[in-house]
Structure formats: structure tokens, C-alpha cells
């Protein structure tokens, strides 16, 4: 029950998550232009990912899509790229969850290969989350470094009665929205990877067999000794057979760093 | 078509008040800014108010702010400016005006003249 | 405040000449979000409230005649009658939209001979 309930919220956590990584990837106030001392200004600018606006005190907003590729900044390019990443990823993985959920059936599937698909989506969602958190970051930084460089440059033309002011450009509300929803998106796929051990079963269980030896009866029960021999009926060496398919142990027990390259 | 009508101006003791209307038509009142002009005697034209368009922001110039205040009623379809403490300096013709592209202003109202003198 | 400068004050021209006047701004009215100009200039007639002639700078208001023309970046900016009418005997303002308060120039008056 405990399990199906972690599963089942990690779901939804991430699904809130990656739509709050697909409205951020898609909002227009990444960066909003910086009011410091005048809260009140007649044109205030905003830029996306996509796109740079001009919102006026006329009511009048007007938008520019970036129609160049190969003129804007690296960075933003690398900023669009993990945001697009963390989407794809988040719905692959979404999709993958729907199918691992233990209250949907689906023809016969074994609570092993769940299991399994529990652990995908939840790597998935987990990287997902840490590629929007990443481009939200590498593009606050970007925010920053530029603030202060036009706050050094502010006041450019002081040489005679002319003032230029230079637009500075602050956080805008997509960058919280981000942040949240790769928050999120990662809980949801550590969710998913805790549900994931819950619903590997704890051990293969194999009906006694009797072995028949002087006149007594002594039930042996493979794989008893598991536990303090390391022996049983899952070995470690069936890795090399099965093209490096993870067993249900490997799976529940052994989640290292290299089961989620 | 839009149409800007400017009523309640006229004649005002110095420290007074007056409250000016401006009923508007043919346009989606509360998207557009709304800006209240005043042209002084000597021909010198001033903006002493204006309200944003969406999220209705206020701006008053220095001479006026503490004195003046813009509102709109989307109900009505009216913009107000209440003035008060009333200076010798305040005498002129009021013009209500939209705003679009640039925040420039192309549709004004014919202006409603304020007096204010002992 | 921007402070906006007009010259000259006033202009006496002939019918059929060209026409300049000037506006001068004391800061940049260049927005780098869009990389326009919010300066507007207009025409008032004796007797009428001001009439939109030009908007960002050199975007002429529909209905206006093609011989008025609007150039000029940052914060020189310049309004052109390439051949001044009869009609054109007006107060010609330019205004600051790109910072509160909006502020407009004293004006030039265009007289006709």
C-alpha cells in the first residue's frame, strides 16, 4: 500500500514538475528589465528563451521571436538545450511511469519488470529535474554577471549634459517557476526510485524440495542462506549472460552509481 | 469610433477642489492607458496623469503628485482626475487622451478649461 | 525628468518649402528592447487638441500625409515637411514617451508668409 502511495505521488509530483519545466521553457519573462529606484516605468522590457517583449504603459505589448540561430548568445543556446533535454526526458519518463504504476494492470506484467520501469522513469525524472535546475542556473548566473557589468556601465554618456541609461535586466518569474518545477521533478523521480525497491520482491521464493538421506527427511530450501553467504538463487554472475540486464536483487539492493549511467 | 468627452472644469478659489470626468466609448476601456493633458495659458502642454492600460498603474508628475489623483470606473467607462489644493498654476484646459503604440496619444477629447483664481 | 528641447520656436515659411525642426532630448529615448525610439511628435491647430502626427520616432500615424516625415535616434530627432501646405500652419510638439513623467518640448509654431 505504502508503495503503490510513494508511487503513485511520485507520479504526480513529477508530472507537476515537468509541466512547470514546459511553462517555464516556454514563458517570455526569463529576465525582466530592473526598476530599482522607479517601480513605475512606461515601457518595461522582458526577454525568454524564445523571444524578447516591450510591454508598454499604453497597454500595447508587442513581441520579437529570435529568428536567428547562429547569432544568439552560447549560452542561451546551451540554456535551451537542457531545458529541452529535461522535457523530452520528463515525457519519455512520464510515459514510462504511467505503464510501472501498480494500480494500472497491464495483460501480465510481473512486478519485476515494474519495478524496473519505476527505476527508469524515475532516473529519468531525476535527470529531467537536475537539466532544468541546471539551465535555470547557468542562465541566473548569465543574469547576474550581465547586471553587474551594466551596473559598472551605467551611466555611459556622462560626458556632457547627455545621460544614457543602460536597461538592466533582473530574474524574472520563470526562473522561480524552474527552479520549483525541477525541485519537483527530481522528488518525483527519487519517489519513484524508492517505490521502485518496494516493488522488487525481497527474495525468489522456490517450493522445498525434499532430498531423501538415511531414512529422515531434510527439507532444503535454496537461496536460505543468502543473506550471510551471498549464495542463492540470484547470482551475481547471471550479468554476464543476460547482456547486462539487472536482476530483481541488483535492482532492490545494489544501486550504485553505475546502474543509472 | 473612439470617443473621448471631458466634463466638470470651470471656475475654482485657490486651496479648492474640482473633480474632472472624461466619459469614454468605442474601445475596450480598461486595456488602453488613459492620460489626463493639460495645456497652460501659454500654450505649454503637460501630462499630470496618467493610468496604465491592464494593470492600471498611476504616474503624476512632480507639480501634481500628493494633489491629484487618476482613477477609472470600467463599469461606466469614465476616467476622473480629483484635483485638489488648487494653485493659480493649475489654470488650463484639460484634454483626456488614450494611448497606444509608443504610448503616444491619438485620440483626444475636445478639453475642459479650469479656472482657479480668487 | 527628460527634459525635451525644441528649436527654433517658431518658423515663417513660404507654401511648397521644406521644412525641419528639431527636438532634442537630455536623455536617450532609445529602448534596447526593441530598438525603438519613444519620441512622438504632433501637430496642434488653433483652436483643436494636438493631433498624432509621428510615433517611435519615424512611424507616421495612419491617415497622415507622406510629406510629414520623422528621423533621428537617442536623442536627436528631427520632424520634416517636405512641402509645407496652407493647412500645415500649426504648433508642432514632440514628446518623451519613454520615461515618466512623459514630458513634451515648449513646441515650434510654423507661420506661413
Known amino acids: 500500500m505504502a508503495v503503490t502511495a510513494c508511487q503513485g505521488l511520485g507520479f504526480v509530483v513529477s508530472l507537476i514538475g515537468i509541466a512547470g519545466i514546459i511553462a517555464a521553457t516556454c514563458m517570455d519573462q526569463w529576465s525582466t528589465q530592473d526598476l530599482y529606484n522607479n517601480p513605475v516605468t512606461a515601457v518595461f522590457n522582458y526577454q525568454g528563451l524564445w523571444r524578447s517583449c516591450v510591454r508598454e504603459s499604453s497597454g500595447f505589448t508587442e513581441c520579437r521571436g529570435y529568428f536567428t540561430l547562429l547569432g544568439l548568445p552560447a549560452m542561451l543556446q546551451a540554456v535551451r538545450a537542457l531545458m529541452i533535454v529535461g522535457i523530452v526526458l520528463g515525457a519519455i519518463g512520464l510515459l514510462v511511469s504511467i505503464f510501472a504504476l501498480k494500480c494500472i494492470r497491464i495483460g501480465s506484467m510481473e512486478d519485476s519488470a515494474k519495478a524496473n520501469m519505476t527505476l527508469t522513469s524515475g532516473i529519468m525524472f531525476i535527470v529531467s529535474g537536475l537539466c532544468a535546475i541546471a539551465g535555470v542556473s547557468v542562465f541566473a548566473n548569465m543574469l547576474v554577471t550581465n547586471f553587474w557589468m551594466s551596473t559598472a556601465n551605467m551611466y555611459t554618456g556622462m560626458g556632457g549634459m547627455v545621460q544614457t541609461v543602460q536597461t538592466r535586466y533582473t530574474f524574472g518569474a520563470a526562473l522561480f517557476v524552474g527552479w520549483v518545477a525541477g525541485g519537483l521533478t527530481l522528488i518525483g523521480g527519487v519517489m519513484m526510485c524508492i517505490a521502485c525497491r518496494g516493488l522488487a520482491p525481497e527474495e525468489t521464493n522456490y517450493k522445498a524440495v525434499s532430498y531423501h538421506a538415511s531414512g529422515h527427511s531434510v527439507a532444503y530450501k535454496p537461496g536460505g542462506f543468502k543473506a550471510s553467504t551471498g549464495f542463492g538463487s540470484n547470482t551475481k554472475n547471471k550479468k554476464i549472460y543476460d547482456g547486462g540486464a539487472r536482476t530483481e536483487d541488483e535492482v532492490q539492493s545494489y544501486p550504485s552509481k553505475h546502474d543509472y549511467v | 469610433e473612439v470617443k473621448l468627452v471631458e466634463s466638470g472644469g470651470g471656475l475654482v478659489k485657490p486651496g479648492g477642489s474640482l473633480k474632472l470626468s472624461c466619459a469614454a466609448s468605442?474601445?475596450?476601456?480598461?486595456?488602453?492607458?488613459m492620460s489626463w493633458v493639460r495645456q497652460t495659458p501659454e500654450k505649454r502642454l503637460e501630462c499630470v496623469a496618467t493610468?496604465?492600460?491592464?494593470?492600471?498603474?498611476?504616474y503624476y508628475p512632480d507639480s501634481v503628485r500628493g494633489r491629484f489623483t487618476i482613477s477609472r470606473d470600467i463599469a461606466k467607462n469614465n476616467l476622473y482626475l480629483q484635483m485638489s489644493s488648487l494653485r493659480s498654476e493649475d489654470t488650463a484646459l484639460y484634454y483626456c487622451?488614450?494611448?497606444?503604440?509608443?504610448?503616444?496619444?491619438?485620440?483626444w477629447g475636445q478639453g475642459t478649461l479650469v479656472t482657479v483664481s480668487s | 525628468d527628460i527634459v525635451m528641447t525644441q528649436s527654433p520656436s517658431s518658423l515663417t515659411v513660404t507654401a511648397g518649402e521644406k521644412v525641419t525642426m528639431s527636438c532634442k532630448s537630455s536623455?536617450?529615448?532609445?529602448?534596447?528592447?526593441?530598438?525603438?525610439?519613444?519620441l512622438t511628435w504632433y501637430q496642434q491647430k488653433p483652436g483643436q487638441p494636438p493631433k498624432l502626427l509621428i510615433y517611435?520616432?519615424?512611424t507616421r500615424e495612419s491617415g497622415v500625409p507622406d510629406r510629414f516625415t520623422g528621423s533621428g535616434s537617442g536623442i536627436d530627432f528631427t520632424l520634416t515637411i517636405s512641402s509645407v501646405q496652407a493647412e500645415d500652419l500649426a504648433f508642432y510638439y514632440c514628446?518623451?514617451?519613454?520615461?515618466?513623467?512623459?514630458?513634451f518640448g515648449a513646441g515650434t509654431r510654423l507661420d506661413l508668409k
Open positions: 487622451a488614450r494611448s497606444y503604440n509608443g504610448n503616444s496619444l491619438p485620440y
Open positions: 468605442g474601445f475596450t476601456f480598461s486595456s488602453y492607458g
Open positions: 493610468i496604465s492600460g491592464g494593470d492600471s498603474y498611476t
Open positions: 536623455q536617450s529615448l532609445l529602448n534596447s528592447g526593441n530598438q525603438k525610439n519613444y
Open positions: 517611435w520616432a519615424s
Open positions: 514628446q518623451n514617451t519613454y520615461s515618466f513623467p512623459l514630458t
